[in-house]
């Protein structure tokens, strides 16, 4: 997942549920025993800070060692630290541990900017805040790293929850996920509620507040509003969708679907930003400037590199516009689409001005490699991964921040023709270049 | 070229208000690719920002001064204006109008400067 | 708030000599820092912006590095015009509103 513009880990404390809960839908399909309802000692499960990552904590090895792991549905490894760094708090002892067994493999992961290489195992994992199991899974003791790790974050490992294919060293490495559903009886799904503080937490603040919840086999509904709309994973490497129109305010950007999806799109609880292919960005940040034309904002701002203030509390939310993804739908020509507040992709920076300022950092980013719907994105919805029907959901999230004019909203049906045509077909390369591109 | 020349009161008595106005010369000040903006230097010391506008009339000010800050603009004239409300003798400064380019980020283009004195 | 600290307060130097002024801020500001140029009686002139682009009409033995929180303005042979009080700013936090406090360089 994308390293030098991680993810913000806030805590729900600027959102308030959207007051009376629309009437479940009636028409779904029956769910298997334990896929819905309340899970309530997991909900609360994730902590973290703005641009950093969301964490939830796991227990690994006998006796049990605690640590804190970034959640990230954009990569397949379960990678711990797993020696001395400067970042870390804590870190996995394998010595230590009874029940460690080396699998005599090295990994090595590059970044764009950074990586990290270590040595591949297996031991045993659960998650204190989740499903009542323990499962043996691979797990990469991260050795040696370089701008992985990051100062003040509070999580020692990265827990990657997409599918086998994007996995290091290769696709024989049975994920974390696919190992517990293999040898328990979770269900093959999981979901995750990511909240947005709306402004800034110090240290102190995050670690006494709340990140979001990330359920694991199932879905709880006093996490969302309204429905659960639904779109098609279209392969399972990374949680690839397919985007069949954008809009801002309203507004059409009337680019051919493929661009939106080029070189796909994928779903990223380890990447901060909405990112967005070069053509799109472009079109879209000209659209974003014209609907906020009442003012002005430097170009490093639209950059995202330089932050903008505004006197605490006078945050003008109303000049910007909202921004709407239309996915493609599990039905023939029906799409749905999800739209975000400005409270979505105007990220709060904490520690740079005086308290009397509230400033805040432009959450769309320009991206090589397609577009990758972070924690920007995320922020707003409640989803679910549900890989068994391999689809994925939204609807509005219980703790999004949004104002008294707005909201994140997840709406549809939407007639939409010829969807196949907006995805990309990557022309088959060496697969070892997947990953290495991801910055 | 564009220039920037400041004109009000060398002398404002405390309690009063302080009136300036720049005007922009040259050039249109409702440029797309500008804001306009204040910033004082008191006798021998450093340079302190006041405060910036946009031609539309959007407005960022300086958090210590904001509570006694207006800035206004007058297309019509090519102006921009600056009233600070119950100056002190602290307020004693050269005032500079300068244009805000670069993509919004510097200070380009300064006006000569106005020497401004608080005192009764 | 961001501060920015200037240094040294007073440069002495002759012309010809090359001229070496610091600007270190509180935090990290990428590379939106300008320096500022300001001779007795006159308004400040824009010499750098983004830590190390020469303004227009800037000669070229004025140049800027850094990046993060450590700049420099490197004067390489001092002209008898060139002394004046040196302001840096930082504008990463917008509008800019920050301003060191000012290096006098002075004829020795």
């Known amino acids: 997942t994308q390293h030098g513009i991680r993810l913000p880990l806030r805590s729900g404390l600027g959102g308030a549920p959207l007051g009376l809960r629309l009437p479940r839908e009636t028409d779904e399909e029956p769910e298997e025993p334990g896929r819905r309802g309340s899970f309530v000692e997991m909900v609360d499960n994730l902590r973290g800070k703005s641009g950093q990552g969301y964490y939830v904590e796991m227990t690994v090895g006998s006796p049990p060692q605690t640590l804190n792991i970034l959640v990230d549905t954009g990569s397949s490894n379960f990678a711990v630290g797993a020696a001395p760094h400067p970042f870390l708090h804590r870190y996995y002892q394998r010595q230590l541990s009874s029940t460690y067994r080396d699998l005599r493999k090295g990994v090595y992961v590059p970044y764009t900017q950074g990586k990290w290489e270590g040595e591949l195992g297996t031991d045993l994992v659960s998650i204190p805040h989740g499903p009542n199991v323990t499962v043996r899974a691979n797990i990469a003791a991260i050795t040696e790293s370089d701008k992985f790790f990051i100062n003040g974050s509070n999580w020692e490992g990265i827990l990657g929850l997409a599918y086998a294919e994007i996995a290091r060293p290769d696709d024989s490495l049975e994920p974390f996920f696919d190992s517990l559903v293999k040898q328990t009886h979770v269900p093959n799904l999981f979901s995750l509620q990511l909240c947005g503080a709306g402004f800034p937490l110090n240290q102190s603040e995050v670690l006494a507040s709340v990140g979001g919840s990330m359920i694991i086999g199932g879905i709880d509904h006093s996490l969302y509003t309204g429905s659960l709309w639904y779109t098609p994973i279209r392969r399972e490497w990374y949680y690839e969708v397919i985007i069949v129109r954008v809009e801002i305010n309203g507004q059409d950007l009337k680019m051919d679907c493929k661009e939106y999806n080029y070189d796909k799109s994928i779903v990223d609880s380890g990447t901060t930003n909405l990112r967005l292919p070069k053509k799109v960005f472009e079109a879209a940040v000209k659209s974003i400037k014209a609907a906020s034309s009442t003012e002005k904002f430097p170009d490093g701002f639209w950059l995202g590199e330089q932050l903008v203030c505004w006197q605490a509390g006078t945050t003008p939310w109303n000049i910007f516009p909202v921004i709407s993804l239309y996915l493609m739908g599990e039905v023939t020509n029906q799409s749905f689409r999800i739209t975000i507040l400005p409270q979505q992709y105007l990220r709060p920076v904490e520690d740079v001005a005086t308290s009397q300022d509230d400033c805040y950092k432009f959450a769309i980013s320009q991206s090589s490699t397609g577009t990758v719907m972070g924690a920007v994105i995320m922020e707003g919805f409640y989803v679910v991964f549900d890989r068994a029907r391999k689809r994925i959901g939204f609807a509005v999230s219980a703790c999004h921040v949004h104002d008294e004019f707005r909201t994140a909203a997840v709406e549809g049906p939407f007639v939409t023709l010829d969807m196949e045509d907006c995805g990309y077909n990557i022309p088959q390369t060496d697969e070892s270049t997947l990953m290495t591109g991801r910055a | 070229q564009l220039q920037l020349q400041e004109s009000g009161p060398g002398l404002v008595k405390p309690s009063e208000t302080l009136s300036l106005t720049c005007t922009v010369s040259?050039?249109?000040?409702?440029?797309?690719?500008?804001?306009w903006g204040w910033i004082r230097q008191p006798p021998g010391k450093g340079l302190e920002w006041i405060g910036n506008?946009?031609?539309?009339?959007?407005?960022y000010y300086n958090p210590s001064l904001k509570s006694r800050v207006t800035i206004s603009v007058d297309t019509s004239k090519n102006q921009f204006s600056l009233k600070l409300s119950s100056v002190t003798a602290a307020d004693t400064a050269v005032y500079y109008c300068?244009?805000?380019?670069?993509?919004?980020?510097?200070?380009?283009?300064w006006g000569r400067g106005t020497l401004v004195t608080v005192s009764s | 708030e961001i501060v920015l600290t200037q240094s040294p307060a007073t440069l002495s130097l002759s012309p010809g000599e090359r001229a070496t002024l610091s600007c270190r801020a509180s935090?990290?500001?990428?590379?939106?820092l300008a320096w500022y140029q300001q001779k007795p009686g006159q308004a400040p002139r824009l010499l750098i912006y983004?830590?190390?682009n020469r303004a227009t009409g800037i000669p070229a033995r004025f140049s800027g590095s850094g990046s993060g929180t450590d700049f420099t303005l490197t004067i390489s042979s001092l002209e008898p015009e060139d002394f004046a009080v040196y302001y840096c700013?930082?504008?990463?936090?917008?509008?800019?509103?920050?301003f060191g406090g000012g290096t006098k360089v002075e004829i020795k």
């Open positions: 983004d830590a190390s």
């Open positions: 300068a244009r805000l380019g670069h993509g919004y980020s510097y200070f380009d283009l």
């Open positions: 935090q990290s500001v990428s590379s939106y």
């Open positions: 700013q930082q504008v990463y936090l917008w509008p800019p509103r920050t």
């Open positions: 506008i946009y031609y539309s009339g959007s407005t």
């Open positions: 040259g050039g249109s000040i409702s440029s797309s690719s500008y804001y």
